[in-house]
């Protein structure tokens, strides 16, 4: 028997320094939590003491904090040649500075390889990308080798920037030949590395002939076995055992997101490769494990361009920036408008002739817009002024809900107006009028949204039994500010960007702003 | 992140005292700030919210048109200036914030004791 | 809006499970929250929205309910977790619940 211990992480998007538990800024250094230093010193403990280690990520390092927002993901490449890592997938998230952003940064500058077998590549960028990522990897482990196949999620052209050269085929389809090809090459022990969610995980496990472990990531599926050691609530145990179409047991693993844990997964294979016995768990790293000095001293003096940056002008904005309470609890905000317009713009993919945009719409809780900006003070727009607006460090988020739940949503936004309460609603891409002489739950009297399957868009009523895209906050997707029916009734749910970094993205592209007040949300009284 | 109260102690009634929370580690400013207490051997009781930016206030019936709450962001500091003071006001104040999408903060308390 | 928690105080064992309800006067959604407070302390939060824990809190403990009717559960008690525990409503002006004191057996 031969003993292969595998390291994992996934969705560590951006989380270079320690964090708060939450994965949010570390404020009690005492009681922070990941950070490339402290998994550098728990990777290299489990180096020193164990023969045979693979050190893997499943995609989505980019997007997530300022660092990706300065660095671009030099910073990926950089700390994780530093931890050096064995191989990595490809997720959604990599393609966000589209695929010049992906290969410039990232796949040059990465000494380990950079899989996906299901992305391929056509027309000029075939030849500009051919061997910066690869289907597989055979690497050499002791005295053995272990095959490595990558896999990325095929909504990527909705949930990011991919340009149109590069085709997402399905997972399963593009895996098993890939995986055949291995087993020629008389590769016996493989493992499936990728970025599609747990459920399609599970699907590669039980459908491709040849997969002897699966390493995922994207939804950011927390598993263990016996009492979790933080808050985060198993979806299952460590590692989840798969029973594939052909009878072999075949173990799933992710290791929840943030860089918050490393995945600790030992597999004992036989001599031809079967799967013996696998066991393990995520291991918390918490601040009973020291951070690295060499790697945390890089990670200073990396930081020192983080602090000029957020001073610096990322636009102007040549009107006040109304996110004062007494509008956006209230009424329509310019501010509302803004931020759900850099939505909108963030998730611009143009992916189908029949469609625009795959999404048109945009909702925002009006308590999470914590602060007005002035354009007296020359119009300029910092980091900063951005962070006292968004001070939450969430993201923004796609969501497919059924127009019944939308409807939901907008009776809740207004259910108890007038007391000044967060839930009130602002939007893009949708019309709204409320009549508050009506009782609550009733109190919406028009709904129009924006089409999308349409080449000049407009606004139609909303229809109860279909199913919408929507961008909306982390925060209302987790049913935050009472939205409970957004939690209990979405049937789809994609992690976006960070919500600063989606809006100083658009004042940078825009260079001057002018948000309006123009009528998306109304009130009427009797008869309409 | 802290919050540290101060201005508690021992005065008679119908006196007056003002409270301090001073705040420090987080945005301040972004926060809707309160107020609550509790009587010695007693539960919980919610005093008073002010918005972040200063625009709203509530108070609890029980101390409405006596006490004032009020803030100075560019000090980082909630104020609640309590007024005709009664025996039954005697308490632990504390400030806290309001639950935000990462949770709550809370100080530690001050207390305060009304008695002739 | 009242909030009526029951029972009072309870008594229990390590390793027990545990439920405290919480009854609101009039519909709140989600708008509750649970905490926890010992002898000379602040309260600490556990549950906010309802059902989502708050950072740092184990996972043994959990919130559930809609509307008028709230529950925290604690799956398996610790030694730790002998104290006093308020619900909060924070639909209309926050309102606590009188507090229910769990004890060791």
């Known amino acids: 028997a031969w003993e292969l211990t595998i390291l994992h992480t996934n969705d560590v998007h951006s989380r270079l320094e320690q964090t708060s538990e939450d994965s949010s800024k570390c404020v009690n250094a005492s009681r922070c939590m990941g950070g490339v230093a402290r998994l550098f010193t728990k990777v290299q403990q489990i180096r020193r003491a164990e023969p045979n280690v693979l050190l893997l990520d499943a995609g989505d390092q980019y997007q997530g904090t300022i660092w990706f927002t300065v660095y671009k993901g030099a910073e990926v490449a950089h700390f994780m040649n530093a931890l050096r890592y064995d191989a990595m997938a490809l997720g959604n998230h990599e393609f966000d500075n589209g695929v010049e952003g992906l290969i410039e940064p990232l796949l040059k500058e990465a000494k380990f390889p950079i899989l996906s077998a299901n992305i391929k590549a056509k027309g000029p960028l075939a030849s500009q990308i051919s061997g910066l990522y690869l289907p597989y990897k055979v690497l050499p482990v002791g005295d053995e080798v272990v095959g490595i196949v990558g896999y990325t999620s095929k909504e990527t052209p909705f949930l990011s920037n991919p340009g149109t050269n590069l085709v997402f085929e399905d997972e399963i389809t593009a895996l098993q030949p890939e995986v055949d090809k291995l087993k020629t090459l008389n590769v016996n022990k493989i493992i499936a590395l990728g970025h599609s969610g747990f459920e399609m995980d599970k699907l590669i496990a039980q459908k491709v002939r040849g997969v002897d472990v699966v390493v995922g990531g994207h939804s950011n599926t927390f598993l263990y076995t016996g009492n979790p050691p933080s808050k985060e609530v198993p979806a299952g145990k460590y590692p989840f055992i798969v029973t594939s179409d052909d009878g072999r047991k075949v173990p799933v693993v992710q290791a929840y997101a943030f860089g918050k844990y490393l995945g600790y997964l030992k597999i004992e294979f036989d001599e031809r490769g079967n799967v013996i016995s696998s066991h393990g768990n995520p291991i918390l790293l918490n601040s009973s494990i020291p951070e690295d000095p060499s790697i945390k001293a890089d990670i200073n003096k990396w930081r020192i361009k983080l602090d000029n940056y957020s001073t610096q002008e990322l636009g102007k904005t040549i009107v006040y920036l109304d996110g004062s309470s007494q509008s956006c609890r209230f009424r329509e905000c310019n501010m509302g408008n803004l931020i759900c317009d850099a939505m909108i713009n963030n998730n611009l993919r143009h992916t189908d002739e029949m469609f625009w945009n795959h999404v048109s719409m945009c909702i925002l809780n009006g308590g999470g817009i914590r602060s007005p900006i002035d354009e007296r003070n020359n119009g300029t727009i910092t980091w900063e002024n951005l962070a006292a607006v968004l001070p939450f460090g969430g993201t923004f988020d796609l969501v497919q809900l059924k127009g019944s739940t939308l409807k939901k949503a907008f009776e809740h936004s207004v259910h108890r107006y007038g007391q000044s309460t967060g839930e009130f609603l602002q939007v893009g891409g949708i019309h709204v009028v409320y009549d508050l002489s009506r009782k609550p739950g009733d109190r919406v009297v028009k709904l129009d949204v924006l089409c999308t399957k349409c080449r000049v868009p407009s606004y139609d009523p909303l229809k109860m039994d279909e199913v919408y895209k929507v961008i909306l906050p982390n925060f209302l997707a987790n049913g935050g500010d009472g939205f409970q029916m957004i939690k209990d009734e979405l049937l789809r749910h994609d992690s976006g960007d960070q919500d600063i970094n989606v809006v100083s993205t658009y004042i940078s592209k825009m260079k001057v702003i002018y948000p309006a007040v123009e009528g998306r949300i109304k009130f009427s009284t009797g008869s309409h | 992140v802290q919050l540290v109260e101060s201005g508690g102690g021992l005065v008679q009634p119908g006196g007056s005292l003002r409270l301090s929370c001073a705040a420090s580690?987080?945005?301040?400013?972004?926060?809707?700030m309160h107020w609550v207490r509790q009587a010695p051997g007693k539960g919980l009781e919610w005093v008073a919210v002010?918005?972040?930016?200063?625009?709203?206030?509530y108070y609890a019936d029980s101390v409405k048109g006596r006490f004032t709450i009020s803030r100075d962001n560019s000090k980082n500091a909630l104020y609640l200036q309590m007024n005709s003071l009664r025996a039954e006001d005697t308490a632990v104040y504390y400030c806290?914030?309001?639950?935000?999408?990462?949770?709550?903060?809370w100080g530690q308390g001050t207390l305060v004791t009304v008695s002739s | 809006i009242q909030m009526t928690q029951s029972p009072s105080s309870l008594s229990a064992s390590v390793g027990d499970r545990v439920t405290i309800t919480c009854r609101a006067s009039?519909?709140?959604?989600?708008?509750l929250a649970w905490y926890q407070q010992k002898p000379g302390k602040a309260p600490k939060l556990l549950i906010y929205?309802?059902?989502t824990l708050q950072s740092g809190v184990p996972s043994r403990f959990s919130g559930s309910g809609s509307g008028t009717d709230f529950t925290l559960t604690i799956s398996s008690l610790q030694p730790e977790d002998f104290a006093t525990y308020y619900c909060?409503?924070?639909?209309?002006?926050?309102?606590f619940g009188q507090g229910t004191r769990l004890e060791i057996k």
């Open positions: 580690g987080f945005t301040f400013s972004s926060y809707d």
């Open positions: 002010m918005s972040y930016e200063g625009s709203n206030k």
């Open positions: 806290a914030t309001e639950i935000a999408a990462k949770g709550d903060y």
């Open positions: 929205a309802a059902s």
């Open positions: 909060q409503q924070s639909y209309s002006t926050p309102h």
């Open positions: 009039q519909g709140i959604s989600n708008y």
